[in-house]
């Protein structure tokens, strides 16, 4: 696994412990919390990052209307179970034996149950809608410049293949970035849209996962873009399975008539 040889750190994941104990004295980095060896030439999976985070000390509309099956991560942080490849296990349980099924980005897609709950497969999140509101700026953003800059960001910083950035919508002050990646489209070595979205989410919260870099400085023709709020919608290849109770107001949170809750990331 590649890492910076000189000081043996992981450029793409600061939540690691690195040492020159790889083959031939090469630098090898392991994710905090899980001890899994990570590839520092690409993004670390969201599952391993969440696990590391939990182990760390605490401190005329042109915009897209989210599909009725869109999920939003309303449950917040949890300590996930990851498979040997670093993917989320389809079934997640907490210490009190409450279990639920998740999608490939680790967001709950069923009601909570007990240990008898079955999650047959890990359902892929194939469409992610990142909804941002930017802070007022002295100079206006041109849509095509903004589009180009965001595509460049996902390509260069998150190493996401350009074909997976489906669209960038802009209706001041709202920006929407659509990421799409079907199972059949994702080749070996391709960054997962869920991982790219998670790195981006942490960046816009001022919690960069990259080693030793300052915060993300995003500019459009020199004009800085500052994000005031972020909301991320996840759409799965198979719609989520929630009981009617949740849809008719019995569930927690807002937006009870849709298969999502509005969860604001500040």
């Amino acid at each position: 696994h590649t890492a910076a040889q000189d000081n043996c750190t992981c450029p793409t994941n600061k939540m690691t412990v690195c040492s020159p104990d790889g083959p031939g004295g090469r630098c090898q980095c392991r994710a905090l919390g899980s001890g899994v060896a990570v590839d520092c030439s690409t993004l670390t999976s969201k599952c391993l990052l969440l696990k590391a985070r939990m182990s760390a000390p605490k401190n005329a509309r042109t915009l897209v209307r989210p599909n009725e099956h869109a999920l939003v991560d309303n449950d917040g942080l949890y300590d996930p179970d990851c498979d040997p490849e670093g993917r989320f296990k389809a079934r997640q349980c907490n210490q009190t034996s409450v279990c639920w099924c998740v999608n490939s980005v680790g967001v709950r897609r069923t009601d909570k149950g007990d240990l008898s709950l079955r999650c047959d497969e890990l359902v892929r999140t194939h469409h992610i809608l990142i909804d941002l509101r930017h802070r007022p700026t002295a100079g206006a953003f041109n849509h095509s410049d903004l589009d180009a800059e965001l595509r460049r960001l996902f390509r260069e910083r998150y190493r996401l293949h350009p074909k997976f950035v489906a669209a960038v919508h802009y209706e001041q002050p709202t920006i929407q970035i659509e990421l799409r990646q079907n199972t059949s489209q994702k080749a070996a070595g391709d960054v997962d849209i869920g991982d790219a979205a998670y790195y981006f989410e942490r960046d816009v919260k001022g919690e960069s996962l990259f080693q030793g870099r300052g915060g993300l400085d995003l500019r459009v023709r020199g004009e800085p873009l500052q994000v005031e709020r972020t909301l991320i919608y996840y759409l799965d290849e198979i719609p989520p399975k929630f009981s009617m109770k949740r849809l008719t107001g019995g569930g927690s949170g807002g937006g009870s008539h849709h298969h999502h809750h509005h969860h604001h990331h500040h």
């Epitope: 002295a138 100079g139 816009v204 001022g206 915060g215 400085d217 995003l218 023709r221 020199g222 994000v227």
Partner: antibody
Framework: QVQLVQSGAEVKKPGASVKVSCKAS????????INWVRQRPGQGLEWMGW????????KYAQKFQGRVTMTVDTSTSTVYMELSSLRSEDTAVYYC???????????????WGQGTLVTVSS | EIVLTQSPATLSLSPGERATLSCSAS?????IYWYQRKPGQAPRLLIY???NLASGIPARFSGSGSGTDYTLTISSLEPEDFAVYYC?????????FGQGTKVEIK
């Protein structure tokens, strides 16, 4: 540490041009914009414009449009501000200042160069 | 253009006293930036994004406000705090500064 060092004082005749340099060090030069601000004797601070070294984008104050030109030399991490058609009212101390920003915050103008006194006199 | 009006123009206080400087904008702005300038020196950033202390600035300085009214407070004046203070907006072009408030020793 981040530092901006400006060229020395200049004395110019009315109608002439002046070119002030600002050399940056201690940070990735292309990662923030360089602003120019002047202070005339006994007056307040007046923003003239900025240039973004990464792509050469620039924004000038309307008041100076047509008279000011900001350029960048990335090989030497230097920004230049040229003011033409000088008049006596342009006598001032000219400052360069960098502005760092992230998606979370705009960190203001910090630090500033030491200032360059430009005197316009016949 | 947005005009920033600072008051008072001059503030005469003694070391140890509390200084309250005001900055009023001609139209609503989202954030204000505060700078200190001493004779023969370049301005120094004190506060960014209305209330955040710039690097290396003592905690006796604080900023607050919203809309059109903003305040810089120095909780207990030190001898080195006697200077001219400027507010600045980044809401619309041209970027503008207030005319300054001079804090002098009484």
């Amino acid at each position: 540490q981040v530092q901006l060092v400006q060229s020395g004082a200049e004395v110019k005749k009315p109608g002439a041009s002046v070119k002030v340099s600002c050399k940056a060090s201690g940070y990735t030069f292309t990662s923030s914009d360089i602003n120019w601000v002047r202070q005339r004797p006994g007056q307040g601070l007046e923003w003239m414009g900025w240039i973004y070294p990464r792509d050469g984008s620039k924004k000038y104050a309307q008041k100076f449009q047509g008279r000011v030109t900001m350029t960048v030399d990335t090989s030497t991490s230097t920004v230049y501000m040229e003011l033409s058609s000088l008049r006596s009212e342009d006598t001032a101390v000219y400052y360069c200042a960098t502005r760092f920003a992230t998606v979370v915050s705009n960190y203001g103008l910090d630090p500033w160069g030491q200032g360059t006194l430009v005197t316009v006199s016949s | 253009e947005i005009v920033l009006t600072q008051s008072p123009a001059t503030l005469s206080l003694s070391p140890g006293e509390r200084a309250t400087l005001s900055c009023s904008a001609s139209s609503s702005v989202n954030y204000i930036y505060w700078y200190q300038r001493k004779p023969g020196q370049a301005p120094r950033l004190l506060i960014y994004d209305t209330s955040n202390l710039a690097s290396g600035i003592p905690a006796r300085f604080s900023g607050s406000g919203s809309g059109t009214d903003y305040t810089l407070t120095i909780s207990s004046l030190e001898p080195e705090d006697f200077a001219v203070y400027y507010c600045q907006q980044w809401n619309s072009y041209p970027l503008t500064f207030g005319q300054g408030t001079k804090v002098e020793i009484k």
